[in-house]
Interface confidence: low
């Protein structure tokens, strides 16, 4: 089955740059296939844009000014490209990649899509940094105690752009676990989010990692946020230790190789 | 030109009552083209769900059904048992792939349908409700309840910011909620929820017994004791601290 | 208790626009459905569309696309009805109201909006 | 769009009696989630509406129970077991069934 990936969630570009947008095709030969580009304005229905076919041919869509979008595939690395030139307002939008995928009854086909890349026009010089900056809330004792049951939660504050992607997964799993987010909010000229896990009491002694995708990382690699086990075996204290908590205890924790 | 108008913008559904969503063509006959629909989800996912001639996305069929209505040129699809993994933007579009002619292999697109889920109607639940802390950020988190309107209180003296809640339905088909904000006074910030004429407070879920939950810290993690003498297992910290760690990556 | 309070009556040439507010008070105002109604002197009533802030989707009545425009402001809980291509048939009083959501009653209404269209 | 058509237009009652109000919609109101969106609202003069029946029968928040929705399908009544001085103005029908929404013309109660 043919698979799509724009490893790009967003690209965000100054008046008059040029965009170039990256569609992965896999499980299928990009040179026997043919793959399209759509676009999706705000408000607007998505709109078929451009598209290059098995044998390079390239059909543009009519009304689409000649010269705007470039499409080109590369074999080598099974990558289509839609350049887009002079980037102004009206090109702000997400673009979609997508191919006609045949199923294993004859004449069924299906078109599927890439995740989408979001374009962004700033005329905002932002601090050099604006990458997701993470903080971590570990269960509180209150409901690993009276829930069986722990919630991790991930805050990523002080990103641009807003486009922004978060998993959670369990240290040595490749499974996307079941999680919760909240809406992403404006703060300043920048973003915050949040996205928080719920785990059964048998899962709290696992490590777990909250996997955020933007645009702005590092190295443009998705940035993993580890969360360490919580351990919850009761002990019980003879009252006569006199060992109440005391309001100045505290506790350091230096965790090491967490760095995305 | 062909138009593909969706018949609501947006459809409320509830979870586990069936709902239709209808897509008329205008300006074409619906039988010439071969329908197919989608949903967008949050982060901009366009899945597969339905083509003309019962081939269905993976994982769609059982709950899906799509159809065509020729006499009053309409594509239906309709979604038997929704559950909350169905919220999203439903499109419909057509082409005519296979029907011979030129350039039919591009998709014509109508403008999304906005399903939001609700739970059911169910008894009134109340929730629990815990505070998680990190240095100044403190989160209020309410699981549980049932019906929706809420309103959460992170109780400080020395607000630095609040933001607005997020509110989610819950995997069991209840809501869940998080507050977060930001205090000088984060030890002391308290949280209260007013749901369904009570409040309920987060000191009221407080563990009372004097036991001791974890991190279990690596081999090069430092970790610093109390400076009481009580005789504790030499890698145990006091769970009360938990989530106050800090993290900067 | 919730209100809508909306803004005062209105007077406008045939082709201007005439933009109405309305504000929510004592109550949550993003997850509710605020529809827009009008009524002629001496008519029936007449839903022209309908805004969920919180999602900041408007639907409208076919008699009305392209020449309505809603909007809500979560920040300041009010709506707003813009009607442009005034003419003397849209001489009306502009009611807002919320509904839990379209398919409901519409539960509170504001006091209404005289809007008169003369040249 | 759906027509909603009410009758009578106007109806003429002694304070005390009841008094019937039909409406009919120009298709069925049954929504495919299986429930049947029409209300009714009093409008009195000078007033905005007020919602008193959602849902065909269920009666709003602090409305009379001498107010009671009934009917299915394309045929609705709304019944008022006692009249009472208050009670005048426009009585309007209103479907949110299909989009658009859409009202009756209205029917004028007043007292003999």
């Known amino acids: 089955a043919g698979h799509l990936e724009q490893p790009q969630i967003s690209s965000t570009k100054t008046l008059s740059k040029t965009a170039r947008l990256e569609c992965v095709v896999s499980g299928i030969t990009i040179s026997a296939t043919s793959v399209y580009w759509y676009r999706e304005r705000p408000g607007e229905v998505i709109q078929f844009l451009v598209s290059i076919s098995y044998d390079g041919t390239v059909r543009k869509e009519s009304g689409i000014p000649s010269g705007k979008f470039e499409v080109d595939r590369i074999p080598e690395t099974s990558t289509s490209t839609l350049t887009i030139h002079n980037v102004e307002k009206q090109d702000i939008a997400t673009y979609y990649c997508a191919l006609w995928e045949a199923q294993q009854e004859l004449g069924k086909k299906i078109k599927v899509f890439g995740p989408g890349t979001k374009l962004i026009i700033t005329d905002k010089q932002l601090d050099a940094d604006v990458s997701p900056k993470p903080t971590i809330f570990l269960p509180s004792i209150a409901e690993t105690k009276l829930q069986k049951a722990g919630t991790y939660l991930c805050l990523l504050e002080k990103f641009f752009p807003d486009v922004i992607k978060i998993h959670w997964q369990e240290k040595k799993s490749n499974t996307i676990l079941g999680s919760q987010e909240g809406n992403t909010m404006k703060t300043n000229d920048t973003y915050m989010k949040f996205s928080w896990l719920t785990v059964p009491e048998k899962s709290l002694d696992k490590e777990h990692r909250c996997i955020v995708r933007h645009e702005n990382n590092k190295n443009g690699v998705d940035q993993e946020i580890i969360f360490p086990p919580i351990k919850t075996d009761v002990i019980t204290m003879d009252p006569k230790d006199n060992c109440s908590k005391d309001a100045n205890d505290t506790l350091l924790l230096q965790l090491t190789n967490t760095s995305a | 030109a062909i138009e593909l108008v969706p018949e609501h913008q947006t459809v409320p559904v509830s979870i586990g009552v069936p709902a239709t969503l209808r897509c008329s063509m205008k300006g074409e006959a619906i039988g010439n083209y071969y329908i197919n629909w989608y949903r967008k989800t949050q982060g901009n996912t366009m899945t597969f769900i339905y083509r003309e001639k019962d081939i269905y996305g993976p994982g769609f069929k059982d709950n899906f059904q799509g159809d065509i209505d020729i006499a009053k040129n309409l594509a239906v699809l309709k979604i038997l048992a929704p559950s909350e993994r169905d919220e999203g933007s439903y499109y419909c579009a057509c082409d005519t792939l296979g029907m011979g002619g030129e350039y039919t292999d591009k998709l014509i697109f109508g403008k999304g349908t906005r399903v939001t889920v609700e739970p059911r109607s169910q008894p009134h639940t109340k929730p629990s409700v815990f505070v998680m802390k990190n240095g100044t950020n403190v989160a209020c988190l309410v699981k549980e309840f049932y019906p929706k309107d809420i309103r959460i209180n992170l109780v400080s003296s020395k607000k630095i910011t609040e933001f607005d809640p997020a509110i989610v339905i819950s995997p069991s088909g209840k809501y869940n909620a998080v507050k977060l904000g930001k205090y000088e006074d984060s030890n002391s910030v308290t949280c209260s929820v007013q749901h369904d004429n009570k409040t309920v407070h987060s000191t009221d879920f407080e563990v009372k017994t004097d036991s001791t939950d974890h991190v279990k810290p690596k081999e090069t993690e430092n970790t610093k004791q109390p400076s009481k003498s009580c005789h504790k297992p030499k890698a145990i910290v006091h769970t009360e601290k938990v989530n106050m760690m800090s993290l900067t990556v | 208790e919730v209100q809508l309070v909306q803004s005062g009556a209105e007077v406008k040439k045939p082709g201007s626009s005439v933009k109405v507010s309305c504000k929510a008070s004592?109550?949550?105002?993003?997850?509710?459905?605020i529809s827009w109604v009008r009524q002629a002197p001496g008519q029936g009533l007449e839903w022209m569309g309908g805004i969920l802030p919180i999602l900041s989707t408007a639907n409208y009545a076919q008699k009305f696309q392209g020449r309505v425009t809603i909007t809500a402001d979560k920040s300041t809980s009010t709506a707003y009805m813009e009607l442009s291509s005034l003419r003397s048939e849209d001489t009306a009083v502009y009611y807002c109201a919320r509904a839990h959501d379209y398919y409901y009653g519409m539960d509170v209404w504001g006091q209404g909006t005289m809007v008169t269209v003369s040249s | 769009d759906i027509v909603m058509t009410q009758t009578p237009l106007s109806s003429p009652v002694t304070l005390g009696q009841p008094a019937s109000i039909s409406c009919r919609s120009s298709?069925?109101?049954?929504?495919?989630?299986?429930?049947?969106?029409l209300s009714w609202l009093q409008q009195r003069p000078g007033q905005p509406p007020r919602l008193l029946v959602y849902?065909?029968?269920n009666r709003f928040s602090g409305v009379p129970d001498r107010f009671s929705g009934s009917g299915a399908g394309t045929d609705f009544t709304l019944k008022i077991s006692r009249v009472e001085a208050e009670d005048v103005g426009i009585y309007y029908c209103?479907?949110?069934?299909?989009?658009?929404?859409?009202f009756g013309g209205g029917t004028k109660l007043e007292i003999k």
């Open positions: 849902k065909i029968s």
């Open positions: 298709q069925s109101l049954v929504h495919s989630d299986g429930n049947t969106y």
């Open positions: 209103m479907q949110a069934t299909h989009h658009p929404l859409t």
């Open positions: 004592g109550g949550t105002f993003s997850s509710y459905v």
